[in-house]
């Protein structure tokens, strides 16, 4: 499955929007820093069965969309930027969705697929629980915004590697 050229442009736009959402200096939130234990192993080359990688990317973006489309995110972040971010993520999901559907039945190891989906889900659970524990403070959102930028960059790298392997 070939992701359209616009897909990587959309990725870059989404990253730019995440950067623009910064409301306070990260230095004022150093005490709130947290290791969310990004599931790096799901994005490493050993994981390289394409159908599975695309599903993991889809889950990553879907969870990002859900995280940023809560009442609490709307209260903490710029609504105009959020709306643009949703549009970009929605397009990413549509692109990946058609790829996942083309690859249905191609997954060689269902157990590995389950583990990957669960690892991504647990990562976002850690982020969600952090936000609730911190009562959705502006510093908590800054920490999460920076974390999502990092995970998004890693997702983009995986997509680039997928493209180069075609």
């Amino acid at each position: 499955c070939d992701l359209p050229q616009t897909h990587s442009l959309g990725n870059r736009r989404a990253l730019i929007l995440l950067a623009q959402m910064r409301r306070i200096s990260p230095f004022s939130c150093l005490k709130d820093r947290h290791d969310f234990e990004f599931p790096q192993e799901e994005f490493d080359d050993k994981q390289f069965q394409k159908a599975q990688a695309i599903s993991v990317l889809h889950e990553m973006i879907q969870q990002t969309f859900n995280l940023f489309s809560t009442k609490d995110s709307s209260a903490a972040l710029d609504e105009t930027l959020l709306d643009e971010f949703y549009i970009e993520l929605d397009q990413q999901l549509n692109d990946l969705e058609s790829c996942v559907m083309q690859e249905v039945g191609v997954i060689e190891s269902p157990l590995m697929y389950e583990d990957s989906i669960l690892a991504v889900r647990k990562y976002f659970q850690r982020i969600t629980l952090y936000l609730t524990e911190k009562k959705y403070s502006s510093c908590a959102w800054e920490v999460v915004r920076a974390e999502i930028m990092r995970s998004f960059s890693l997702s983009i790298n995986l997509q680039k590697r997928l493209k180069s392997k075609e």
Epitope: S55, H58, E59, Q62, L93, E97, M101, Q125, L129, T132
Partner: antibody, heavy 119, light 108 residues
């Protein structure tokens, strides 16, 4: 507000199949995995499996792999579960429940469909 | 699969009494993925406690949850009539997700 609508009851004959529905409203259907749970009368709950409505990929409890088939119809924002080769052991209430994270995990359930398998 | 064993299966408590329900896991469960649900006859389960100790929206403060590893509990500091229901623990730490067999709590 989030709602999951399920029909109240289905009466089916042994050996037959039944297709249960779960119509979603109040949220973006394709953004959340949909789960199905079985409850026999006076018993505990059993997780059957889940489906991502966005692309239709499924994850099943091994115990239900040959019994249940999960599908979705995005146009009618409805999730389905087909149960095949029914026996009295399949007589139960079947719930759909929406995935999510933190305080949203299984925070929304359908009312459940009572399936009665009887000749 | 992770088997969750709840005890007691049925218990009754007087109004004002402190109640503790337990959930024992066959293998270790990360506390972030241990949930409790309340169910009343003829109704669907309701999320009650998430991630071991966090009360779901609308749950009275007399409820609390605690535990780690293989041992978890739900406590009611002072039993009230409306608390009479079945309570199920649930884990999604690993596939297949599982529920306990439930504790039916009755009012004396």
């Amino acid at each position: 507000q989030v709602q999951l609508q399920q029909p109240g009851a289905e009466l089916v004959k042994p050996g037959a199949s039944v297709k249960l529905s779960c119509k979603a409203s109040g949220y973006t259907f394709t953004n959340y995995w949909m789960h199905w749970v079985k409850q026999r009368p006076g018993q505990g709950l059993e997780w059957i499996g889940e489906i991502n409505p966005s692309h239709g990929r499924t994850i099943y409890n091994e115990n239900f792999k040959s019994k249940a088939t999960l599908t979705v119809d995005k146009s009618s924002i409805t999730a389905f579960m087909q149960l095949s080769s029914l026996t009295s052991e399949d007589s139960a209430v079947y719930f759909c429940a929406r995935g999510g994270l933190g305080p949203a995990w299984f925070a929304y359930w359908g009312q459940g469909t009572l399936v009665t398998v009887s000749a | 699969q992770i088997v969750l064993t709840q005890s007691p299966a049925i218990m009754s408590a007087s109004p004002g009494e402190k109640v503790t329900l337990t959930c024992s896991a066959g293998s270790s469960v990360d506390s972030s993925y241990l949930y409790w649900y309340q169910q009343k006859p003829g109704s669907s389960p309701k999320l009650w406690i998430y991630s071991t100790s966090n009360l779901a929206s609308g749950v009275p403060a007399r409820f609390s949850g605690s535990g780690s590893g293989t041992s978890y509990s739900l406590t009611i500091s002072s039993m009230e009539a409306e608390d009479a229901a079945s309570y199920f623990c649930h884990q999604w730490s690993s596939y297949p997700f599982t529920f306990g067999s439930g504790t039916k709590l009755e009012i004396k």
